[in-house]
Interface confidence: medium
């Protein structure tokens, strides 16, 4: 399977909410011995590989923001901890998963990575990620709402297997 990022850049005004989205394309293994783990984290544009460094989003680590289930089930993060930080990650039945950030500040700007790990117990782990940039702007040049820029087909398939 692949992870695609429909949008590679989100430009948003301070105070707005933003929902960053990733999409799983292709078959994901199903069965009692398969676990799908999805999460989000901040990273930097590493020289070797994007998304290798894992930094917290609003002090929440990728472990705090994970979604964890078998197959393509819908899921949400534990609401209490994430919502206290104005965050919510969610997943639907169609391979889409997202993180919503409320009341954006300039400090939220950065490179966001979504991570999917397919665990086939007793066999292997397959790790895939996608990356997108969030720019939070303030002042007269800031847009009134979030403006999103579609990924080129080449950029949107950021595939890393493990």
């Amino acid at each position: 399977f692949k992870v695609t990022t429909p949008y590679s850049l989100y430009v948003c005004p301070e105070g707005q909410n933003a929902t960053l989205t990733c999409r799983i394309l292709g078959p994901v293994s199903k069965g009692h011995d398969v676990t799908i783990y999805k999460t989000w984290y901040l990273s930097s544009r590493g020289e070797v590989q994007m998304c290798s460094e894992r930094r917290p989003i609003r002090n929440l680590t990728f472990q705090d923001l994970h979604l964890h289930h078998g197959g393509h089930q819908a899921a949400n993060t534990s609401h209490d901890l994430a919502q206290r930080h104005g965050l919510e990650s969610a997943s639907d039945h169609h391979g889409n998963f997202s993180i919503t950030m409320r009341n954006l500040t300039l400090l939220d700007s950065g490179l966001y990575c979504c991570l999917v790990v397919e665990i086939r117990h007793h066999h292997s782990e397959h790790r895939v990620h996608g990356a997108m940039e969030l720019q939070v702007q303030t002042g007269k040049d800031a847009p009134s709402n979030c403006v999103v820029y579609p990924s080129s087909s080449q950029d949107s398939e950021n595939i890393t297997a493990a």
Epitope: T39, F62, S124, E125
Partner: antibody, heavy 118, light 106 residues
């Protein structure tokens, strides 16, 4: 503060079985897998297996199937490893360690020393 | 299973000296992880995903590599770095560790 507190050292007789506990605190127990690692004679590390407190799912190193049984008690955030039909080869230090999927074992228990001797 | 071979098995270095140890995998792995263990203590995560420092790890440590060949480097040896270092892979079951490199201070 993240902590993994393991049960104390054990001296057991050959052929007996025993259970080691690993009590987790300071983090969401169901958000990680709990892994068990054997270290013999202060040298090589061997991965025994893992259990997901989220759904109770386990994965074992084939070498330890039938030797180790992993369980969890979510209500007390405790992982257990039972070692069966012990022999001198099982004398070692056993560690529990937490791991997030797609990551590494970032916190380890202090280790439980098991000595099998008649 | 994937066998990880570490070399050298034992090495010594003077304070301030650069140290490099290697980990060779019998099959290609996507990422390598490194742990440090001192006598009487539990292993400690040093490096994840081949080259990223775990929280609290000094900047003198670095990791690199790909495929079947990986290395851990200490830019300037310090006395507190004397320990045994293990590489480990999570790419395929069973997850395996290297046999360790024991680093001593001269």
């Amino acid at each position: 503060e993240v902590q993994l507190q393991q049960s104390g050292p054990e001296l057991v007789k050959p052929g007996a079985s025993m259970k080691i506990s690993c009590k987790a605190s300071g983090f969401s127990f169901t958000g990680y897998t709990m892994n068990w690692v054997k270290q013999s004679h202060g040298k090589n590390l061997e991965w025994i297996g893992l259990i997901s407190p989220y759904n109770g799912g386990t994965s074992y190193n084939q070498k330890f199937k039938g030797k180790a049984t992993l369980t969890v008690d979510k209500s007390s955030s405790t992982a257990y490893m039972e070692l069966l039909s012990l022999t001198s080869e099982d004398s070692a230090v056993y560690y529990c360690a937490r791991r997030a999927y797609g990551y590494a074992m970032d916190y380890w228990g202090q280790g439980t020393s098991v000595t099998v001797s008649s | 299973q994937i066998v990880l071979t570490q070399s050298p098995a034992i090495m010594s270095a003077s304070p301030g000296e650069k140290v490099t140890m290697t980990c060779s995998a019998s099959s290609s792995v996507s990422y390598m992880f490194w742990y440090q263990q001192k006598p009487g203590s539990s292993p400690r995560l040093l490096i994840y995903d081949t080259s990223n420092l775990a929280s609290g790890v000094p900047l003198r440590f670095s990791g690199s590599g790909s495929g079947t060949s990986y290395s851990l480097t200490i830019s300037r040896m310090e006395a507190e770095d004397a320990a045994t270092y293990y590489c480990q892979q999570w790419s395929s079951y069973p997850f395996t560790f290297g046999s360790g490199t024991k680093l001593e201070i001269k």
